[in-house]
């Protein structure tokens, strides 16, 4: 199809080489009020569309994305050629940063339902650059945490070093929905609830004498509880003796509950005490069996191919540790009688 009639938008993605970050493009199809099939209120009622409105369907997946090769080759269907780019409804997600993402991306409806729809498309010219060291030292991360129940703020990474007085107008989206009253370089949250968690996008306009473009950043916001003040507790084993049958295989499970920590480095291991000696046992990897906002339960098993007489003289110790402290639980094996 002819893309010369598409409306054009220029975007800049400046990514940090230090951290993983994502990027999104919205299919901003020109419409006076709402995108029929994206169900996203992106234009204010007073904003004038650049083209005639698109008479779209309500099918959320009814939009097609293409990339325009720089060599003039035909348009390429994003889904077929770019595994690191995912289409979700009307949004294109870039999972990994890199200058190779630079290029022209075109979106348009799959179903052409009226003569006006032929020109109903948007061409987004994306420029991707690594962040220079000249950027401010304490720029906000693309992953930000908000402490539940307290006040907090979400900063636009590309503007986090600017004061409120200097900051340009910022357009914010949360999970693809326009936040029309959030217009500054940070969203101030009076009290943090779990619904504040999500993917936030901040846009602002930069211009020179020739043209203007949108600078965009994506922020993953997580709502968290305060760091635990407690050391982990062992839920299993509870008893310090365990009846076993000699010659049979045995699995002893250690389950421990770790309170939430922003920097989480849990330790769970088994070691064996035999008279004056003790050594760590190489056992299968620990696995998380339950994770909630407040805590995580981690399990690690010790496996004996067959219980020997020697094992009855030993103590099997589960050791768990977080940044606050450690807890141990020892188990003595006892032969089953009768």
């Amino acid at each position: 199809f002819n893309i010369s009639g598409c409306s054009t938008k220029k975007l800049l993605w400046t990514y940090s080489t230090r951290s993983e970050e994502e990027f999104v493009l919205f299919c901003d199809l020109p419409e006076p009020q709402k995108s029929h099939f994206c169900h996203r209120n992106r234009l204010s009622p007073k904003q004038v569309p650049e083209h005639l409105p698109f008479m779209g369907s309500n099918d959320l997946s009814d939009v097609q994305w293409y990339q325009q090769p720089s060599n003039g080759d035909p348009l390429e269907d994003i889904r077929k050629s770019y595994p690191h780019i995912i289409q979700d409804k009307c949004t294109l997600h870039f999972l990994t940063p890199g200058v190779n993402n630079s290029g022209s991306y075109i979106c348009r409806p799959k179903m052409i339902k009226s003569p006006y729809d032929v020109a109903c498309c948007v061409k987004m010219i994306l420029e991707v650059k690594p962040q220079t060291n000249a950027s401010c030292e304490y720029s906000a991360s693309h992953k930000q945490d908000l402490l539940l129940g307290s006040t907090g703020s979400i900063s636009c990474p590309s503007l986090s070093c600017q004061s409120d007085a200097q900051s340009p107008a910022v357009t914010w989206y949360k999970n693809g929905k326009l936040l029309s009253v959030e217009r500054s370089n940070r969203i101030v949250v009076d009290e943090v609830y779990d619904y504040h968690q999500g993917t936030y996008v901040c846009d602002y306009t930069q211009s020179d004498t020739v043209s203007s473009w949108t600078v965009r950043a994506v922020v993953q916001v997580r709502t968290i509880v305060g760091d635990t003040k407690l050391k982990p507790d062992i839920l299993d084993p509870v008893e310090d003796t365990l009846e076993v049958e000699l010659g049979k295989p045995l699995t002893i499970s250690c389950k421990a509950r770790f309170g939430f920590e922003r920097v989480f480095n849990p330790v769970i291991k088994w070691y064996i005490k035999d008279s004056d000696l003790e050594w760590e046992v190489s056992v299968p990897e620990a696995k998380s069996i339950k994770s909630t906002l407040k805590d995580e339960i981690i399990e690690r098993n010790i496996i004996l191919e067959k219980v020997t007489q020697r094992d009855l003289r030993r103590k099997f110790v589960c050791f768990v540790q977080n940044s606050i402290g450690n807890t141990t639980q020892s188990v003595q094996l006892k032969e089953k009688r009768g």
């Epitope: 204010s44 904003q47 004038v48 409120d164 007085a165 900051s167 340009p168 107008a169 357009t171 029309s180 009253v181 959030e182 217009r183 500054s184 101030v188 949250v189 009076d190 009290e191 602002y204 306009t205 930069q206 211009s207 203007s212």
Partner: antibody, heavy 113, light 111 residues
Framework: SVEESGGRLVTPGTPLTLTCTVS????????MSWVRQAPGKGLEYIGI?????STYYANWAKGRFTIAKTSTTVDLKITSPTTEDTATYFC???????????WGPGTLVTVSL | AAVLTQTPSPVSAAVGGTVSISCQSS????????LSWFQQKPGQPPKLLIY???TLASGVPSRFKGSGSGTQFTLTISDVQCDDAATYYC???????????FGGGTEVVVK
């Protein structure tokens, strides 16, 4: 800086356009608000224009005013002035939908028969 | 529509003393903190003092303090100076922008 102009004596029903000229920053990057103040009275919020050109008006101002912009100016059109629209009109750079730190000196509009 | 009700005028203050002006919003301002305070002297445009309910604007003396959340807000001026004689306005931002409004103003007279 910000400066309003276009205020003058008009007769009721004669449309009037006030202009706010900005320098030192780009209207592509900032939101702007209009506020008015009748003689001896308090401040009244009229409305806002976003960097994108989207406009929002105070409930009482809808239909009575139109805000538009060019690359360096923001216009406020009083569609059909009445004597109650006699006031000094200010434009101001805006943060998070409220007037912020850069205000013009204001321009006086008098509506009289 | 939103209504912002301020302390009735005038309010008297002695030089060196403290004065407080209240601003009551109905309904709550957006995010409980989208409230600004302005100072205006005759023949001049308003000057921003406080935004986000309690953040001091650049260049404003720390004698000015904003507090409050939701529907009740206060501007406190400590160590009052003669230059503080002016009319003070609160302005509230709401989840529906068309509800944004100013309070009626409170005149502070310094003796």
């Amino acid at each position: 800086s910000v400066e309003e102009s276009g205020g003058r004596l008009v007769t009721p029903g004669t449309p009037l356009t006030l202009t706010c000229t900005v320098s030192g920053f780009s209207l592509n990057s900032y939101d702007m608000s209009w506020v008015r103040q009748a003689p001896g009275k308090g401040l009244e919020y009229i409305g806002i224009i976003y960097d994108s050109g989207s406009t929002y008006y105070a409930n009482w101002a809808k239909g009575r005013f139109t805000i538009a912009k060019t690359s360096t100016t923001v216009d406020l059109k009083i569609t059909s002035p009445t004597t109650e629209d006699t006031a000094t009109y200010f434009c101001a750079r805006t943060l998070n939908t409220l007037p912020f730190n850069i205000w013009g000196p204001g321009t006086l509009v008098t509506v009289s028969l | 529509a939103a209504v912002l009700t301020q302390t009735p005028s005038p309010v008297s203050a002695a030089v060196g003393g403290t004065v407080s002006i209240s601003c009551q919003s109905s309904p709550s301002v957006y995010n409980n903190n989208r409230l600004s305070w302005f100072q205006q002297k005759p023949g001049q445009p308003p000057k921003l003092l406080i935004y986000y309910a309690s953040t001091l604007a650049s260049g404003v003396p720390s004698r000015f303090k904003g507090s409050g959340s939701g529907t009740q807000f206060t501007l406190t001026i400590s160590d009052v100076q003669c230059d503080d004689a002016a009319t003070y306005y609160c302005a509230g931002g709401y989840s529906t922008i068309s509800d944004n409004a100013f309070g009626g103003g409170t005149e502070v007279v310094v003796k």
